[in-house]
Interface confidence: low
């Protein structure tokens, strides 16, 4: 987790001077409670925007948003604490809006907004705004929290962003996959324009089960530039087990930007149609 | 936390081999892939291959195919990168990194071991 870029970060708006801090995440009210503190936030709001850096590369960020209440709590709200927790590695990272002059209710609803937090493809996270000074230990909540869930890079628009680039989002391979005679499998699919070699994973399952029955990998050296964006066809020697029938293609690509976490495309091959077999019919016919 | 510690630096004559350790900790060790990663002087970074320290299973770039070999000993939580046949152009830092096979990012590196090659 990172805020894009460390350029000057603004909070301020018409009526309010704010400046923009980092955070530990431990606001010293939580230490020093005070005796009055402001009501929640109102309205958050997540979504997903897409913001440059200065170097030019486009990562996918939060867009957080949220309004006060129109309540006397105002006049003791001191700022607010911004915390973004990645939930499968529990990483947070926290910035603090530190309200320099003392907020009046105006004609308009106050709305903020902030929209620095880099977060990743494939990732959900739970953003929470804090209205400060944090409540004492048993005073109401002034907090409000949502999960986000940024799209992976399959996402029209997340495809073009940095992160997903540099894990080979634009590489289409367009793999298909054939059975052929005597237990094989044909695996065509088209190369990128590196000189990276690639992996092909195969699994296989019986129809209807999770659990795999064959495993197999078979390694493709780095093509010569002539080679690029051809297509490479393999074919796949399967174990001849009984009923081990349903196979995934997984085509893993080194490109050097991702090394070995490109994103990998599969495809997979279904068991064959079972006819439908007749109910016997029985040769009596029971007396009841 | 999670913890990638590596051995300490090592100077070499040109032929020799040498061999970098890597300690993990903080993490199931066999739950996430190990790569091998090398940074010379002012060149980018360099990736060597990669192990699979569940099965042993390793992948080489190309360009190392013949010189290095990966391992690891499971009980330790350790995995190893072996480079033979040095020659001065292989004077770098040598990386271990985590990285999932399904994450976009490696996300946790070691400190890094300068190997020095010179006669």
């Known amino acids: 987790l990172r805020l894009l870029d460390h350029r000057a970060l603004v909070c301020s708006q018409p009526g309010l001077n704010c400046t923009v801090k980092n955070s530990t995440c431990l606001d010293d009210s939580w230490i020093h409670p005070r005796n009055l503190t402001p009501s929640s936030p109102k309205d958050l709001q997540i979504q997903l925007h897409f913001a440059h850096t200065q170097q030019g590369d486009l990562f996918p960020v939060a867009h957080i948003e949220w309004t006060l209440q129109t309540d006397a709590s105002i006049l003791y709200l001191e700022g607010a604490e911004l915390s973004v927790l990645q939930l499968n590695t529990n990483e947070r990272l926290c910035v603090r809006f530190e309200f320099l002059s003392k907020l009046r209710h105006h004609h308009r609803r106050w709305r903020f907004t902030f929209s620095h937090f880099v977060v990743d493809p494939d990732q959900e996270y739970e953003v929470t705004v804090h209205h400060l000074p944090k409540p004492i230990p048993d005073g109401d909540p002034n907090h409000q929290s949502k999960n986000f869930l940024v799209p992976d890079c399959e996402h029209a628009r997340m495809k073009v962003t940095t992160p997903c680039m540099s894990s080979g989002s634009l590489w289409d391979p367009n793999i298909t996959v054939e059975t052929l005679e005597a237990h094989q499998l044909r695996v065509s699919f088209t190369l990128w324009n590196e000189s990276t070699h690639y992996q092909i994973l195969l699994t296989s399952f019986p129809h209807m089960e999770n659990h795999s029955c064959f495993e197999h990998m078979h390694h493709i050296p780095a093509p010569r530039p002539e080679e690029f964006h051809q297509r490479s066809n393999v074919t796949l020697t399967l174990r001849n087990l009984k009923g081990c029938c349903r196979h995934q293609v997984q085509i893993q690509p080194f490109f050097s930007s991702c090394l070995n976490d490109c994103l990998r495309h599969s495809a997979t091959v279904s068991c064959p149609e079972m006819p439908d077999t007749p109910e016997p019919i029985p040769d009596y016919m029971p007396l009841w | 936390q999670v913890q990638l510690v590596q051995s300490g630096a090592e100077v070499k004559k040109p032929g020799a081999s040498v061999k970098v350790s890597c300690k993990a900790s903080g993490y199931t060790f066999t739950s996430y892939d190990i790569n091998w990663v090398r940074q010379a002087t002012g060149q980018s970074l360099e990736w060597m291959g990669w192990?699979?320290?569940?099965?042993?299973?390793?992948v080489y770039a190309q360009k190392f195919q013949d010189r290095v070999t990966m391992t690891r000993n499971i009980s330790i939580s350790t995995a190893y990168m072996e480079l033979s046949s040095l020659r001065s152009e292989d004077t770098a830092v040598y990386f271990c990194?985590?990285?999932?096979?399904?994450?976009?990012?490696?996300?946790?590196w070691g400190q890094g071991t300068l190997v020095t090659v010179s006669s």
């Open positions: 990194a985590r990285g999932r096979r399904d994450d976009w990012k490696n996300n946790y």
């Open positions: 192990m699979n320290p569940k099965s042993g299973y390793t």
